[in-house]
């Protein structure tokens, strides 16, 4: 089941999936002046069996001189700011994916790829947040969001992260001591079925992650 929306936006923060659950789709998008080849894949799909997961299909871009199908509206400054949290990050993958069955690693870049990636996440996907450079993380709880199925609808949990404007960068997923907050996550779960997976294994994995995956973008 695809998640209805993107993960929540946190001011002055970016989010990143460390691995992608089977069923995740990635748009085959091309940079300005290029378009997807006519016979090429429309998207990449994370598929697999019990022992191995990988991305099906390959994205390919070609010059769009023949037909202008890659027009891009130049974003206004406020729109650029709005998009900042979801701009494509470096595809380096410091995690050994063997430790997370049923997941794909970040796909490598393809030639003339767009500078932003749009993933279509599935229920159970977890993403992790980090404050952008120049902001410091104040945690009230986990700096992560999970796509859950509740009452037949999908929603993302709200990450408990506030990024303050002190000129200091915290370590990912956060070297700051959590603020005293015994209540944990704010959302109250009702008695209906909530579909989530992989919480524990992904949380443990996140503790080993490096900050560098958040700090590089494609030029």
């Amino acid at each position: 089941e695809l998640c209805d929306d993107d993960p929540p936006e946190i001011p002055h923060a970016t989010f990143k999936a460390m691995a992608y659950k089977e069923g995740t789709m990635l748009n085959c998008e091309c940079k300005r002046g290029f378009r997807r080849i006519k016979s090429g894949s429309l998207y990449m799909l994370c598929t697999g069996n019990s022992s191995h997961s990988s991305w099906d299909n390959q994205c390919q871009c070609t010059s769009s001189a023949t037909r202008n199908t890659t027009k891009q509206v130049t974003p206004q400054p406020e729109e650029q700011k709005e998009r900042k949290t979801t701009e494509m990050q470096s595809p380096m993958q410091p995690v050994d994916q063997a430790s997370l069955p049923g997941h794909c690693r970040e796909p490598p870049p393809w030639e003339n790829e767009a500078t932003e990636r749009i993933y279509h996440f599935v229920v159970g996907q977890m993403v992790y947040y980090q404050c952008v450079q120049g902001y410091r993380a104040l945690h009230r709880g986990p700096a992560e969001s999970v796509c859950k199925m509740t009452h037949g609808k999908t929603r993302w949990t709200q990450p408990q992260l506030i990024c303050t404007g002190e000129m200091e960068t915290s370590q990912f997923p956060g070297e700051e001591k959590p603020q005293a907050s015994p209540e944990g996550r704010p959302e109250s779960e009702t008695s209906c079925l909530v579909t989530t997976t992989d919480f524990q294994i992904q949380t443990e994995m996140a503790a080993t992650m490096e900050t560098s995956i958040f700090t590089t973008e494609y030029q």
Epitope: L2, D4, D5, D6, M25, L26, N27, C28, E29, C30, R35, R36, L42, Y43, T69, T70, K71, Q72, V73, T86, A114, E116, I118, Y119, H120
Partner: nanobody
Framework: EVQLVESGGGLVQAGDSLRLSCAAS????????LAWYRQAPGKEREFLAA???????LYADSVEDRFTISRDNPKNTVHLQMDNLKPEDTAVYYC?????????????????WGQGTQVSVSS
């Protein structure tokens, strides 16, 4: 609640052009494709074109040389420029929004539909 409102339909002569617009509201459409379909009397609803947030496009072979889809993300609108119209283009044209990447979604599987706008092409 999601709303898709089409505009721009009408009666034109063969060979003329027409530009349809669709205003989408009620949610973020960043991870949705916006698409155009049409349905002629007595026929099934037919996929025409789709576009992603980053302007990746897909066209039905039947209209690829004459129709152009475009998207204005700040305004949450999608347009369909139709050139060199033919009498067989006469139909009700529908705007659609669907989760996921650009792909030719079968009409029964589309998440959201507009109410449609009539396009009539006389010879």
């Amino acid at each position: 609640e999601v709303q898709l409102v089409e505009s721009g339909g009408g009666l034109v002569q063969a060979g003329d052009s027409l530009r349809l617009s669709c205003a989408a509201s009620g949610r973020s459409f960043r991870n949705y494709i916006l698409a155009w379909y049409r349905q002629a009397p007595g026929k099934e609803r037919e996929f025409l074109a789709a576009i992603s947030w980053l302007d990746g496009t897909l066209y039905a072979d039947s209209v690829e040389d004459r129709f152009t889809i475009s998207r204005d993300n700040p305004k949450n609108t999608v347009h369909l420029q139709m050139d060199n119209l033919k009498p067989e283009d006469t139909a009700v044209y529908y705007c659609a929004a669907d989760r996921g990447p650009v792909r030719p979604v079968l009409a029964p599987d589309v998440d959201y539909w507009g109410q449609g706008t009539q396009v009539s092409v006389s010879s």
